[in-house]
Structures are given as C-alpha cells and as structure tokens.
C-alpha cells in the first residue's frame, strides 16, 4: 500500500536569466527511493538521479541544469520558455511510483525587479491597513458600548424613579489594544435584542472583517 505523499515547492516564480531550485520531498513512508526523474512540461527528460548510478543530466541541458540540492534540481540561466509545469517522479521500493508537480513562472527581469521593489512597501502598507482596521473596530465597539450604556443609564434613571432600583449587569470587556475581534456574528453586547437596520449592517461589517483579519491579528472572542 502506498502511504507516502510528495510535497513540492508548488507554484514558484523566478527572474529571467536567474536560477531556481525545483524541490520535491517524499514523506509519510519508509520506502527506499531508488530513482528520481525530473521532466519538463512536454514530458521531456531534464535529469535522473539514481541511488546507485548518481545523476544523469539530459545532454542538451547540461550547461544550465545543476544537480541538487539533494534530490532536487537547479535550473540556471532561465528563459521565458522555461515557464510551465515540471514533474518529479519518485521510484521507490517497495511502494512503487510517486509523482509531484511544480509550476514555474519565469518573469521578465523588469517585472521581477518591479515586483521585488514594490513587495516590501506593499507588505508595509497592508500591515498599516490592518492596524487601521483593527483600531477602527475597537473604536466602533467602544463607541457602540458607550452609546448603549448611556441609553441604559437614562432608562435606568427613569426606572429607578418608578421601581426598587434593581440594576441590570451588562458584561463589558473591551478588546485589548492592537487586537481584532474574531466575529462570527456581531457581538451580542452591541445589538442585544434589537434587530433594526443599523444592527444588521453592523452584523455584516463584523462578518466581513472576521474573514479579512483571520491569521493577521490576535483574536479576542467576545460573548454577549
């Protein structure tokens, strides 16, 4: 029975004229790897790594295909024609054959440089946006609570004149600074029993936000 899985570098991009490492890894099996074949998009051979015979590089690629690291392959002096699928085929004993796929996109030098130049500022801008969204959420939550507590206090002061003055406890726990609300629905403390348009809008806002913030912020779960 074949229990192993091939893990690959997946979809990768590299600069024209540069180099890239194609890497596959066989895991979850004790099978012995006897040979690894590397093939290009049209299934033409690039290289073979045999456990006993070493490496065989297809002659036409000898100048720009380097063996390794490990069972991987390094493609050098990349051209636009190198864009496409690459396959690693693992022959193993006793399992048999495993196959992995990698997609390589070769980018024009200017495009690659452009993307590299703007990648860091872009990440910074995204991080800033997340921080701003988080702060906005906190402000909305705090303001909404204040508004509600003011409303409750005015109602209570009216009630206290008519009744024994029993006070209603509303759980209140503000989000810690720099964190986001993990919201599957708008927190109950904000909407309570009200089901008006404003509350529905806020409900949707929190749902959208929860998708955007997952994995980017530390979560604070509020129960209402």
């Amino acid at each position: 029975m074949m229990t192993g899985t091939i893990e690959t570098t997946g979809n990768i991009s590299a600069k024209k004229g540069g180099s890239v490492i194609l890497q596959c890894h066989l895991s979850s099996t004790m099978a012995q790897v006897t040979q690894v074949n590397w093939e290009q998009h049209d299934h033409s051979l690039l290289a073979i790594r045999n456990a006993e015979l070493g490496w065989h590089i297809y002659p036409a690629f000898k100048d720009r295909v380097a063996p390794g690291p490990g069972l991987g392959l390094t493609l050098q002096s990349l051209t636009m024609n190198d864009t496409g699928e690459y396959f690693c085929t693992y022959h193993t004993y006793p399992d048999g054959t495993y196959r992995g796929r990698i997609f390589l996109e070769v980018l024009e030098s200017s495009v690659a440089e452009h993307s590299a130049r703007f990648q860091i500022p872009l990440l910074g801008a995204m991080a800033m946006m997340l921080v701003v969204i988080c702060i906005a959420v906190i402000v909305v939550v705090v303001l909404a609570r204040k508004k509600k507590s003011l409303r409750i206090h005015s109602v209570e002061s009216g009630l206290q004149r008519k009744s024994t003055g029993q006070e209603e406890q509303i759980p209140s726990a503000p989000s810690p600074p720099g964190s986001c609300v993990q919201a599957e629905a708008a927190p109950a403390g904000l909407c309570g029993e009200q089901q008006g348009d404003d509350c529905a809008e806020l409900h949707d806002y929190f749902n959208v936000l929860s998708y955007r913030s997952l994995g980017s912020c530390s979560f604070f779960t509020e129960t209402g």
């Epitope: 040979q35 051979l45 045999n50 006993e52 015979l53 065989h56 590089i57 036409a60 000898k62 054959t97």
Partner: antibody, heavy 119, light 107 residues
Framework: QVQLQQPGPELVKPGTSVMLSCKAS????????MYWVKQSHGKSLEWIAF????????TYNQRFRGKATLTVDKSSSTAYMHLNTLTSDDSAVYYC????????????WGAGTTVTVSS | DIQMTQSPASLSASVGETVTITCRPS??????LSWYQQKRGKSPQLLVY???TLPENVPSRFSGSGSGTQFSLKIDSLQPEDFGNYYC?????????FGAGTKLELK
C-alpha cells in the same frame, strides 16, 4: 556524424598495464558520459565503468574497481581507460561507447580494441 | 546485482518470419531496459531504449515492449541483415548488466 575511434589490438605481458584510448568526434564531448564495456571471446558484455567529461566524475562496476581507471582529456575529446596488473582473464575486446540521451544505456559504440595478455 | 535472463539462447528463423526474444530482470526495473544487436566481428548497436523507444536509424520492423520484470523484442519480417546476436541491458542500478545474449541464425 558521431564517431568513436579506438586504436588497433594490444599485445601485453602479464603483470603490466595498458592505456586504451577512445577519440570522440561529431558531437559535444562534454555533454555525454563515456562508457567502457568488456567482451571476452564468445561471451556476453560486461559494463566496466563510465565517466562524465563535464565534471570528471566516474562510476564503476564494483567488480572492476582497482582494475580500471577512467580519465578524459577534454581538449582532445579523448577518453582513456587504464587497466593495471593484467592477467589472462583481462584478454578481451574493450569497447568505448557514448551514453544515451535519456539514461544509462549506450547510444553509439566504438569499434573496440582487442587486448591480448600473453607472455 | 540485477540478473538479466534472456531467452531463447539461440533460435533459427527464415527471412520474412517474425521472431520474439524475451528478457527477464531479477527485479522490477520499470521500463529502464535497452536492446542491442551485434553482428559477427562488429561492435554492438543500440536498437531500443527505455523498453520501447527506437533510435531514429533503427527500422520500424523492430519493436520493444514490456515493463517491470518482463520484456520482449519483436522483429517483424526478418531481413538478411538481422541475423546475429541480441543483448538486453538494464539501466536502473549499479552494476549495469547485460543478458547472456540470443543468437539469431538463418534457418
């Protein structure tokens, strides 16, 4: 076209050594491994070793380790096999062959050199 | 080592006949098998590699098939120049080994 030139027969004394050559032409010498194969009289073929002229690395059949040594001279596109401490068991035809495009098979063969070990 | 058992050791056939030679490696070699033809006093020549692929210069009457531990070389409509010795070779591990050969003779 691809050609592998091997010299004529060699008559050598037991205990001595011999250097066999194989001159390649008609292709990019460094791109293909060069193989050496032994064929004793009336017998089958035995792979000895191969060498990759690109990096000088060679792979041997364990049976011939210590008996054969492969080298290349890229400037003259020539492969060499040195056989030492010769005995009558080493009497055979020795072929050089260019490796295949797609693996460890032998795509083009030389005419062979007959080595006779005799006192 | 992977042992290559070739059969038959020899066979006689006439021009125009079809013949099949088989090769059985002692273990699974996938499709990493080649076939060679050697005429008397000449060096071997590649006929088939990777079990079924023919080099450009080889006539289409030759065909290879098989995988794992069972391979065969078929020659359709034998020609006078086809008589000689045939060898199989695996290219899947060290040492590379050849079969003992099949001698194809004219009947």
């Amino acid at each position: 076209q691809v050609q592998l030139q091997q010299p004529g027969p060699e008559l050598v004394k037991p205990g001595t050594s011999v250097m066999l050559s194989c001159k390649a032409s008609g292709y990019a010498f460094s791109r293909y491994s060069m193989y050496w194969v032994k064929q004793s009289h009336g017998k089958s073929l035995e792979w000895i070793a191969f060498i990759d002229p690109y990096n000088g690395g060679s792979t041997y059949n364990q049976r011939f380790r210590g008996k054969a040594t492969l080298t290349v001279d890229k400037s003259s596109s020539t492969a060499y096999m040195h056989l030492n401490t010769l005995t009558s068991d080493d009497s055979a035809v020795y072929y050089c062959a260019r490796g295949g495009d797609y693996g460890w098979y032998l795509g083009v063969w030389g005419a062979g050199t007959t080595v006779t070990v005799s006192s | 080592d992977i042992q290559m058992t070739q059969s038959p050791a020899s066979l006689s056939a006439s021009v125009g006949e079809t013949v099949t030679i088989t090769c059985r490696p002692s273990e699974n070699i996938y499709t990493y098998l080649s076939w060679y033809q050697q005429k008397r006093g000449k060096s071997p020549q590649l006929l088939v590699y990777n079990a079924k692929t023919l080099p450009e210069n080889v006539p289409s009457r030759f065909s290879g098939s098989g995988s794992g531990t069972q391979f065969s070389l078929k020659i359709d409509s034998l020609q006078p120049e086809d008589f000689g010795n045939y060898y199989c070779q695996h290219h899947y591990g060290n040492p590379l080994t050849f079969g003992a050969g099949t001698k194809l003779e004219l009947k």
